[in-house]
Interface confidence: medium
Amino acid sequence: EVEKTACPSGKKAREIDESLIFYKKWELEACVDAALLATQMDRVNAIPFTYEQLDVLKHKLDELYPQGYPESVIQHLGYLFLKMSPEDIRKWNVTSLETLKALLEVNKGHEMSPQVATLIDRFVKGRGQLDKDTLDTLTAFYPGYLCSLSPEELSSVPPSSIWAVRPQDLDTCDPRQLDVLYPKARLAFQNMNGSEYFVKIQSFLGGAPTEDLKALSQQNVSMDLATFMKLRTDAVLPLTVAEVQKLLGPHVEGLKAEERHRPVRDWILRQRQDDLDTLGLGLQGGIPNGYLVLDLSMQEALS
């Protein structure tokens, strides 16, 4: 807390300019009118205030707007945004996409901070819905933001936003989210050639259906085991041994190390042991020779 002291004669700030950087903290507190600061917030970012001075400026704004800053001030916070706490931000009502962009720009290139997460939450709640423009903006700054959305919210994601997504941004997505994102990625990348397409679609394959995996197996894609292990179990089970061999290419040898883990374990249980033996990997647990395989799911569909 800065002590209340009278402003020295001749030091009262008439405008926010560079001369203020030579003011001591108590002088800033005493000589800068909060209302003047609020109307000239756009100048603050261009002036090289120290961190300590920024604390004083924030304190002045907090006193002027105890219920939360108006959007006209928020839009011009610039680096002062980094001084805000989530509690401060919860008092704001941010409705302009330009304001959101201006503040996200300050934190650009770094992971989402608690301040940014709170800001986005306030913005989305203020808008009442997650529209395409908002999503475009958020995925441009934080592609990983997709995995924090519900499947319902993801349904409004435009396929064009998918281009900004990096593989690591999908690490926290669960299968239900990938089920929604995969068709969008398929649409976004549909005009790419085979190998380039696979590189782009690979991280979304946790949402791919069986028929798409079968189609990929015909394209010499050499899927790595890490990707295979993230595939939907229900999509992997209908694949034949030959299809899995083609899908994995030289990586097929990795199945042995994963034979006790899903989806490999469940897939093995569905294959004929004879077919598994053709891989020469010593995979065990397939259907013994001479046994009849009944596809109960098909039977249920027929009845």
Partner: antibody
Framework: QVKLKQSGGGLVQPGGSLKVSCAAS????????MSWVRQAPGKGLEWIGE????????VYTPSLKDKFIMSRDNAKNTLYLQTSKVRSADTALYYC?????????????????WGAGTTVTVSS | DVVLTQSPAIMSASPGEKVTMTCSAS?????MYWGQQKPGSSPRLLIY???NLASGVPVRFSGSGSGTSYSLTISRMEAEDAATYYC?????????FGGGTKLEIK
Amino acid sequence: QVKLKQSGGGLVQPGGSLKVSCAASGFDFSRYWMSWVRQAPGKGLEWIGEINPDSSTIVYTPSLKDKFIMSRDNAKNTLYLQTSKVRSADTALYYCARRGSHYYGYRTGYFDVWGAGTTVTVSS
Amino acid sequence: DVVLTQSPAIMSASPGEKVTMTCSASSSVSYMYWGQQKPGSSPRLLIYDTSNLASGVPVRFSGSGSGTSYSLTISRMEAEDAATYYCQQWSSYPPTFGGGTKLEIK
């Protein structure tokens, strides 16, 4: 490789003028605040002032405010320091220095890259 | 202006010896920065934000302190550490430097 290459300086007569240059390479010069610092013989380092990336803000240490003019040309990746009416007290090694920048673009409180220095000797 | 006073002005140490130098500020600062300067060379950043090592600086260097009192420590002196060390603040304008501590090798 990040580098600041200085030129200019030399012997200047009292009352004469001076222009020192600092050419930057190996980084995006147009993103950084740049400073000039000087060191008189046998003395410590003294900050002269700084200039922001687009030249819209130039700050000088109060005691030298009317003595120096700082400028920059981002197209040429070059920083300049000019002065006129030099005195013997201005004899020093003049350094250009880059002010560090955080990942999010906000300037830090330190100089992370320095030029090799330019010697200025004021003498008749 | 914040005046930074370094002590001692000159000191010497044997290889392998622990070295500590101090920097006292005339008013409280939030962070201190430390640099190293060898004869004929420009200054080089060693420590930023009081205790963080700059890129490429050996781990034998460390910084600490708060308020008006800060220090730089070299855990084990090496011949290449012979130089002048200066402290610097930018908690208030103008940024100021200490007068330096000249470290010599015994």
